[in-house]
């Protein structure tokens, strides 16, 4: 057991197995479930995280009105197919040969079909609206302090460039964080807004994905910001294709 082995961990993803067996004895970490090598300097893709989660033992007014095309993840957990880069494959199927198309954050964007269903491309989610309700506090948070703290959080904890945090809206007790990132804006090395939103969602639920770190301790000017409800809306570059039956349900 060497010092190198002690150092060989994945700070950004605890759902990994690491060993110093990479090129030249360098540390290499692989995601549970998929066995894919992950870059531990940044966030792991949501697809690989979902796959790892499914493989793990089961234990446990200024406000924005989401557009008519906004998607909410109502389907919950599934074991996804990821491409060699760790992104969601455009078509996902379950063990009973039921298939559907997903967007870049893995949320279903079509009706379910059979194996003949075609999903021509992975449609990018370019706008994410995170809708939070905070627990009652003595008074409202200062909007600019709240804005600065959330931008700092997304930069420092989730490695997301501040330019992708489009806006922070606040009408006590509702906070809305808008993340925007078009395909053309995302450079190599940039964290994907979908991955940042997923890490944030898990943090809020008290299920941090970071290695050995304490949970999320959000404070605005020293005052704890405790979230009691979260809703996340996803807007795709191409609107989803659902039948009228679903839309009128």
């Amino acid at each position: 057991h060497t010092a190198a082995q002690d150092n060989c961990t994945c700070p950004t993803n605890k759902m990994t197995v690491c060993s110093p067996d990479g090129p030249g004895g360098r540390c290499q970490c692989r995601a549970l479930g998929s066995g894919m090598a992950v870059d531990c300097s940044t966030l792991t893709s949501k697809c690989l995280l979902l796959k790892a989660r499914m493989s793990a033992p089961k234990n446990a007014r200024t406000l924005v009105r989401p557009s008519e095309h906004a998607l909410v993840d109502n389907d919950g957990l599934y074991d996804p197919d990821c491409d060699p880069e760790g992104r969601f494959k455009a078509r996902q199927c379950n063990q009973t040969s039921v298939c559907w198309c997903v967007n870049s954050v893995g949320v279903r964007r079509t009706d379910k079909g059979d194996l003949s269903l075609r999903c021509d491309e992975l449609v990018r989610t370019h706008h994410i609206l995170i809708d939070l309700r905070h627990r009652p506090t003595a008074g409202a948070f200062n909007h600019s302090d709240l804005d600065a703290e959330l931008r700092r959080l997304f930069r420092e904890r989730y490695r997301l460039h501040p330019k992708f945090v489009a806006a922070v809206h606040y009408e006590q007790p509702t906070i809305q964080i808008e993340l925007r990132q078009n395909t053309s804006q995302k450079a190599a090395g940039d964290v994907d807004i979908g991955d940042a939103a997923y890490y944030f969602e898990r943090d809020i639920k008290g299920e941090s994905l970071f290695q050995g770190r304490g949970g999320l301790d959000l404070r605005v000017r020293g005052e704890p910001l405790q979230v009691e409800r979260t809703l996340i809306y996803y807007l795709d570059e191409i609107p989803p294709k659902f039948s009228m039956k679903r839309l009128t349900a």
Epitope: N7, T9, V38
Partner: antibody
Framework: QQLEESGGGLVKPEGSLTLTCKGS????????WMWWVRQAPGKGLEWIA?????????TYYASWAKGRFTISSTSSTAVTLQATSLTAADTATYFC???????????????WGPGTLVTVSS | FEMTQTPSSVSEPVGGTVTIKCQAS??????LGWYQQKPGQPPKLLIY???TLASGVPSRFKGSGSGTEFTLTISDLECADAATYYC????????????FGGGTEVVVK
């Protein structure tokens, strides 16, 4: 714990060279970033590139360094910087430094090598 | 993104106090380091996280500030403090910009 750079010296204009940074007393397999910084004679510090030496090998480059400089880490004990198409403006002392955290955006340099002088002249 | 350091040079007597300012063109929270460099030597980390003293650095060195405005104060100046001081951040490293300030030469009379 210390760092040491090697590979500096006199290079002709349009020439190329490879600088190596070796660590002793610690292993490069940790969860941190290694950086190259340079300093022209009598001038300030200028960041060139950095590489994550844990699992992943992510890199970042200064805008002006992209395409001409390449940072790499092929072993758990060394980081290299390759430079091409050198000009007199690249004459400087080149330092390697170890970042203190896993997060590239919250990094400061707690260990530096003594530097190696690169002179570009015909 | 740019780090602007002022002044470029300052001269104070032994026992005096020097104040160096560093301004970031955008909010960098508390992600700022201060370094001391003497001729022929690599820089030495003095302060990180805007105000935390690095190991072995005397308490005469004090860092403060957050957001865009930062200050390094050296009190009870000693001859050994004669050096060039740099501020540094990596907050916007993905923009490919130099995170170092231009440097401040401190002369101790």
């Amino acid at each position: 714990q210390q760092l040491e750079e090697s590979g500096g010296g006199l290079v002709k204009p349009e020439g190329s060279l490879t600088l190596t940074c070796k660590g002793s007393g610690f292993d490069f397999s940790g969860t941190y970033w290694m950086w190259w910084v340079r300093q022209a004679p009598g001038k300030g510090l200028e960041w060139i590139a950095c590489i994550y030496v844990g699992s992943g090998s992510s890199t970042y480059y200064a805008s002006w360094a992209k395409g001409r400089f390449t940072i790499s880490s092929t072993s758990s004990t060394a980081v290299t910087l390759q430079a091409t198409s050198l000009t007199a403006a690249d004459t400087a002392t080149y330092f390697c430094a170890r970042g203190a955290t896993n997060n590239v955006f919250m990094n400061y340099f707690n260990l530096w090598g003594p530097g190696t002088l690169v002179t570009v002249s015909s | 993104f740019e780090m602007t350091q002022t002044p470029s040079s300052v001269s104070e007597p032994v026992g005096g106090t020097v104040t160096i300012k560093c301004q970031a063109s955008e909010d960098i929270s508390s992600n700022l380091g201060w370094y001391q460099q003497k001729p022929g030597q690599p820089p030495k980390l003095l302060i990180y996280g805007a105000s935390t003293l690095a190991s072995g650095v005397p308490s005469r060195f004090k860092g403060s500030g957050s957001g865009t405005e930062f200050t390094l104060t050296i009190s009870d100046l000693e001859c050994a403090d004669a050096a060039t001081y740099y501020c540094q951040t990596s907050y916007y490293i993905d923009d490919g910009v130099n995170g170092f300030g231009g440097g401040t030469e401190v002369v101790v009379k």
